[in-house]
């Protein structure tokens, strides 16, 4: 019989749980990557775009060597959640010019979503303690303008580009150690 | 045009050190990582690391840890490789070359530098 | 760290043939419909040129001549026909797991 139910499984094998946690993150890195550029395409944008409730990147020079899973993962984990949260409010705060974007949006939202549970789903195969965000998610305001929602969705999927790109490296380095 | 530029050919001794550059230009810098292979005579290619030039975070092929740094000038889209200790082993033909991010496929290369170490 | 053995090691071939270049994996480098290898081309004094990448993906600008397939373990660089800017030496490298790696090269000559 297996453990008892809502008691963590640790994994036999914590390796194919990370593979599959990656696999995951490069696929969504791949759909960002595509619909940033097809956001360069329809409204180009000079520049970094900065939103203030994003997260701050998470690695810096240096740090990665130091990494150990469980701050990855609960590093990762919050960070996705407010990118979700933030490709959530594009989606409903958008307007007329990004509505023709909808339909990706909602797919990597979906993905994000899925992404999200498989990462949860590896914290709890690992026993490690599922933590909540720092502080309490501050409510995202209406976009000053259509410009200001673009934005904004350009600030989005750069960040979650960068993000999901620290998250690979971070995780495949984090296998070799296992 | 894309293009990663590469500094020239350098002569060491065994034991001194070698920093290399690699200025970028006809694309936007932060976009992609920044991989080093290294290529010496009747050796295959082998992948040194590669940093992400947006924040300038490092990651190094275990056994090139210790001896390479990778850095970034992000001001003037350069990426710089410098390696320590440096022995004969080391004398081989050094690529930046620029990686698509979470992926390790390398679609743009320089032109090489080759280092040559002999006492 | 995956092993990549290319073979052959040299191949002789005419202008107008098709080459084929094997590339074999020490462990599977696929996974849910992505496999992580990628095929160079290099030519003496040159840098490596990006061919293919995620087993079967042109490149931009690279003739469609060139093709790659396999999964798992086993792939393959299909060249036809051949043409006289060909002949260079051909790497296969996985992405699969850190660190990235490449195959010892094939290098395909002229008859």
């Known amino acids: 019989p297996g453990p008892p139910a809502g008691s963590p499984r640790v994994s036999s094998d914590p390796r194919a749980d990370l593979d599959s946690a990656v696999l995951l993150t490069r696929s969504l890195l791949a759909d960002t990557r595509q619909l940033a550029a097809q956001m360069r395409d329809k409204f180009p944008a000079d520049g970094d775009h900065n939103l203030d409730s994003l997260p701050t990147l998470a690695m810096s020079a240096g740090t990665l060597g130091s990494l150990q899973l469980p701050g990855v993962l609960t590093r990762l984990r919050v960070d996705l959640m407010s990118y979700f949260r933030h490709v959530q409010w594009l989606r409903r705060a958008a307007g007329p010019s990004l509505k023709t974007l909808e339909p990706e949006l909602g797919a990597l939202q979906a993905r994000l979503e899925r992404l999200l549970r498989r990462l949860q789903l590896l914290m709890s195969r690992l026993a490690l303690p599922q933590a909540a965000p720092d502080q309490p998610a501050v409510p995202l305001g209406p976009p000053a303008s259509a410009w200001g929602s673009i934005r904004a969705a350009h600030a989005i999927l750069g960040g979650l580009h960068l993000t999901l790109d620290w998250a690979v490296r971070g995780l495949l380095l984090l296998k070799t150690r296992l | 045009e894309v293009q990663l530029v590469q500094s020239g050919a350098e002569v060491k001794k065994p034991g001194a050190s070698v920093k290399i550059s690699c200025k970028a230009s006809g694309y936007t810098f932060t976009d992609y990582n920044m991989d080093w292979v290294k290529q010496a005579p009747g050796q295959r290619l082998e992948w040194i690391g590669d940093i992400n030039p947006h924040n300038g975070g490092p990651i190094y092929n275990q056994k090139f840890t210790g001896r390479a740094t990778l850095t970034v000038d992000k001001s003037a889209s350069t990426a710089y490789m410098e390696l320590s200790s440096l022995r004969s082993e080391d004398t081989a033909v050094y690529y930046c070359?620029?990686?698509?991010?979470?992926?390790?496929?390398?679609?743009?290369w320089g032109q090489g530098t080759t280092v040559t170490v002999s006492s | 760290d995956i092993v990549l053995t290319q073979s052959p090691a040299s191949l002789a071939l005419s202008p107008g043939e098709r080459a084929t270049l094997s590339c074999r994996a020490s462990?599977?480098?696929?996974?849910?419909?992505?496999?992580?290898i990628h095929w160079y081309q290099q030519k003496p004094g040159q840098p490596p040129r990006l061919l293919i990448y995620l087993a079967s993906n042109l490149d931009s600008g690279v003739p469609a001549r060139f093709s790659g397939s396999g999964s798992g373990t086993d792939f393959t660089l299909n060249i036809h026909p051949l043409e006289e800017e060909d002949f260079a030496t051909y790497y296969c490298?996985?992405?699969?797991?850190?660190?990235?790696?490449f195959g010892q090269g094939t290098k395909l000559e002229i008859k």
């Open positions: 490298q996985h992405s699969r797991d850190l660190p990235p790696t």
């Open positions: 070359a620029r990686g698509e991010l979470g992926h390790w496929y390398f679609d743009v």
């Open positions: 462990k599977s480098v696929s996974t849910s419909g992505y496999s992580y």
